[in-house]
Interface confidence: medium
């Protein structure tokens, strides 16, 4: 037997697990595909990315809208020559998410 | 040219990207390795898991301490035989994290 309070708690948790934009730590270099002689400090930034659960296994949490936000980072060249330079780096920020079908696989692939 | 205020903003963001326990959505069935004829509703729960950035590429964010927390979920058997039952499910919750060296690779692997 279960009471309404227990169900409310379960429902609230479920709502929180749903597919939605959530703050995520992303590695800037991987994002930008920068050359190996340039790196960024901090190496990671916080942005919103789609994540969470979908009701069905055939669905995945995908972004439906994206904005690009500018983060101030130190761009450092190796070997170090000048004082590290602050540069604006644009990183994708997911603003909308939806549970969408995974891309159908070709029967012969 | 950058001022101290800019550096403070960067520093605050960097602190937030550090390796630490962060709320994550995990799929219960995968966690428990349950048989395919049993599934849970909600299928996902929120727990804390280690995540975030480490200063060096050779380090990864790993859990150093774990507690197990109980989540009330509906366990449903397929085919449905009885009323879904609320069961307590224990899920790992990371309480401490550290940037640790990745396992050294065997030279012949």
């Amino acid at each position: 037997f279960y009471d309404i309070e227990t169900l409310k708690v379960i429902d609230e948790e479920w709502q929180r697990t749903q597919c939605s934009p959530r703050e995520t730590c992303v590695e800037v270099a991987s994002e930008l595909g920068k050359s190996t002689n340039t790196f960024f400090k901090p190496p990671c930034v916080n942005v919103f990315r789609c994540g969470g659960c979908c009701n069905e296994e055939s669905l995945i949490c995908m972004n439906t809208s994206t904005s690009y936000i500018s983060k101030q980072l130190f761009e450092i060249s190796v070997p170090l020559t000048s004082v590290p330079e602050l540069v604006p780096v644009k990183v994708a920020n997911h603003t909308g998410c939806k549970c969408l079908p995974t891309a159908p696989r070709h029967p012969y692939s | 040219f950058y001022d101290i205020e800019t550096l403070k903003v960067i520093d605050e963001e960097w602190q937030r990207t550090q390796c630490s326990p962060r709320e994550t959505c995990v799929e219960v069935a995968s966690e428990l390795g349950k048989s395919t004829n049993t599934f849970f509703k909600p299928p996902c729960v929120n727990v804390f898991r280690c995540g975030g950035c480490c200063n060096e590429e050779s380090l990864i964010c790993m859990n150093t301490s774990t507690s197990y927390i109980s989540k009330q979920l509906f366990e449903i058997s397929v085919p449905l035989t009885s009323v879904p039952e609320l069961v307590p499910v224990k899920v790992a919750n990371h309480t401490g994290c550290k940037c640790l060296p990745t396992a050294p690779r065997h030279p012949y692997s």
Partner: antibody, heavy 117, light 112 residues
């Protein structure tokens, strides 16, 4: 408000080691991207960059003087220390502590160090 | 090391008249990131150097607009459109593109 102040002996003898301390306020050397460095200026001459230290303890030295210089920091005390070994009369100069940004904006007032027997 | 050569060494000026200082580097100051880290400082008598111009032509906050910087590659110029009495002192150019960061020998500006 950012301030930097140098302290150390006004007079050192040849072959001795010079130890200079920079005490700063208005910022922290634990802040991401922050650096503190040293620049000197012999009387009536040009400025010469010596060394600097970054928030994560990376250190950079002028290659010409590298073997004689050591820079270190005490973040909790807001201090950076420069030591220079085997002092010579040609090292007589005003030594400035600077906050390292690109370019140098905040400088200490400088401390004159004379090397003489 | 990058050698920074300033001319003239001394510059006697009349208040209200323009003044120009040249700075030449022994190597291009264009960084691989595209920026040129050439800066100008003024050291007034008995004081620490103060930043006037950064990255060739950007006036630092509070610096009067009579000061301007120009140039590229290895040749740079600081201009004062109308010299004032408070502008006396030694002007230094400086590069922070290449380690070690280096300074010019200075140009002493004095009132005639």
């Amino acid at each position: 408000q950012v301030t930097l102040k140098e302290s150390g002996p006004a007079l050192v003898k040849p072959t001795q080691t010079l130890t200079l301390t920079c005490t700063f306020s208005g910022f922290s050397l634990s802040t991401y991207g922050m650096g503190v460095g040293w620049i000197r200026q012999p009387p009536g001459k040009a400025l010469e960059w010596l060394a600097n230290i970054w928030w994560e303890d990376d250190k950079y030295y002028n290659p010409v003087l590298r073997s004689r210089l050591t820079i270190s920091k005490d973040t909790s005390k807001n201090q950076v220390v420069l030591t220079m070994t085997n002092m010579d009369p040609v090292d007589t100069a005003t030594y400035y502590c600077v906050q390292v940004t690109n370019p140098f904006v905040f400088w200490g007032e400088g401390t004159l160090v004379t090397v003489s027997s | 090391d990058i050698v920074m050569t300033q001319t003239p060494l001394s510059l006697p000026v009349t208040p209200g008249e323009p003044a120009s200082i040249s700075c030449r580097s022994s190597q291009s100051l264009v960084h691989i990131n595209g920026n040129t880290y050439l800066h100008w400082y003024l050291q007034k008598p008995g004081q620490s150097p103060q930043l006037l111009i950064y990255k060739v032509s950007n006036r630092f906050s509070g610096v009067p607009d009579r000061f301007s910087g120009s140039g590229s590659g290895t040749d740079f110029t600081l201009k004062i459109s109308r010299v004032e009495a408070e502008d006396v002192g030694v002007y230094f150019c400086s590069q922070s593109t290449h380690v070690p960061w280096t300074f010019g020998g200075g140009t002493k500006v004095e009132i005639k």
